[in-house]
């Protein structure tokens, strides 16, 4: 199934003019994501059942090895490039989590809904970051990495990788909201 965010090799060919207050909109989207991240994390680990709720440090710790770095003290351009990479990584990861949860927890509709809503905001954020990079800094291409593919993992690994990713998401989104 298609992932919610499929970034293209950007060529700075923006079809529509960028939003007037682009940076404000980016800040608003980051604040929105930060405001709902903890609730999403709780909803996720609760839906997985035991042993997850009682082993959060071990099973849901934010130790995601290949996660793109972020340096809060960089220039706006450098921070936007790093934000772009992070949003692409989170978007594909969230797509994998959503796909897995529809199979593993088909009746957890509130979790599915929150995952989809988060993916929607990330999609909008990605569009805005790209617009800013193209219009102000003429950056048309950013090398990206994608979240881990969970398709071939067993049930426990699917759940654990999802929990770790959402633990990392909760942590990084607070940093990003602060940095912009």
């Amino acid at each position: 199934s298609p992932l919610p965010i499929t970034p293209v090799n950007a060529t700075c060919a923006i079809r529509h003019p960028c939003h007037n207050n682009l940076m404000n909109q980016i800040r608003s989207q980051l604040a929105q994501l930060n405001g709902s991240a903890n609730a999403l994390f709780i909803l996720y680990y609760t839906a997985q059942g035991e042993p997850f709720p009682n082993n959060l440090d071990k099973l849901c710790g934010p130790n995601v090895t290949d996660f793109p770095p972020f340096h809060a003290n960089g220039t706006e351009k450098a921070k936007l490039v790093e934000l772009y990479r992070i949003v692409v990584y989170l978007g594909t990861s969230l797509g994998n989590i959503t796909r897995d949860q529809k199979i593993l927890n088909p009746s957890a509709l509130s979790l599915h809904s929150k995952l989809n809503a988060t993916a929607d905001i990330l999609r909008g954020l990605l569009s805005n970051v790209l617009c800013r990079l193209c219009s102000k800094y003429h950056v048309g291409h950013v090398d990206v990495t994608y979240g881990p593919d969970t398709s071939g993992k067993d049930v426990f690994q699917k759940k654990k990788l999802g929990c770790q990713l959402l633990g990392k998401y909760k942590q990084i989104i607070a940093v990003l909201a602060q940095a912009f």
Epitope: P51, L104, G152, K153, D154, Q157, K158
Partner: antibody, heavy 118, light 106 residues
């Protein structure tokens, strides 16, 4: 359906490769092929599984690591390479298929007999 | 890593009676437990998956229950055709596992 082949009489310390072939279908991306064995008069013993999609994730029983290797060799075949065989490896070897999330085996081959003896 | 313990190892039952087979996991496997029937010289046949869902074409005389670590397979109105070995199997975690199957009940 699934069918195993390659079962044979082999000498101790010898090697053997078993093949699991899908008939009437090709492996879809969301599919696992696993190997399970059964020694004469004994229970079912899981050996290994492979995800036949792009990532090719593999899972092995702790005792099988190093001596057994599971591989996808085509869109319809998966092999199990076995080395340093002993009499304890004498068994009927089954291949089994599992759909995502791979928690149960809904398709089984008839099995192929491997005998390790001098 | 979950280990599966199945009891009893063997049992006899009169035709028309009820059989109860238990399967215990050494740690939680949620509801990812399946049951198989195997007759001599044949391949295993899936009976039940996700603890209580009957596989296609399987008689409703077979009933599965349980979650977490304790699971049960019940066969009511036993027929001669039910004479077989029954195995439970956990499908929750395949990493660092000795065997996903229980020892079997004959």
């Amino acid at each position: 359906s699934l069918e195993e082949s390659g079962g044979d009489l082999v000498k101790p310390e010898g090697s053997l490769t078993l093949t699991c072939t899908a008939s009437g279908f090709s492996f879809s991306t969301d599919y696992w092929i696993c190997w399970v064995r059964q020694a004469p008069g004994k229970g079912l013993e899981w050996i290994a599984c492979i995800y036949v999609g792009t990532s090719g994730d593999t899972y092995y029983a702790t005792w099988a690591k190093g001596r057994f290797t599971i591989s996808k060799t085509s869109s319809t075949t998966v092999t199990l390479q076995m080395t340093s065989l002993t009499a304890a490896d004498t068994a009927t070897y089954f291949c089994a298929g599992a759909d995502n999330p791979y928690d149960y085996f809904n398709l089984w081959g008839p099995g192929t007999l491997v005998t390790v003896s001098s | 890593t979950p280990d599966m313990t199945q009891t009893p190892a063997s049992m006899e039952v009169a035709v028309g009676g009820t059989v109860t087979i238990k399967c215990q996991a050494s740690e939680t496997i949620s509801g990812y437990l399946s049951w198989y029937q195997q007759k001599p010289g044949q391949r295993p046949k899936l009976l039940m998956y996700r603890a209580s869902t009957l596989a296609s074409g399987v008689s409703s005389r077979f009933k599965g229950s349980g979650s977490g670590t304790q699971f049960t397979l019940t066969i009511s109105g036993v027929e001669c055709a039910d004479a077989a070995t029954y195995y439970c199997q956990q499908g929750y975690s395949y990493s660092d596992t000795d065997n996903v199957f229980g020892g079997g009940t004959e």
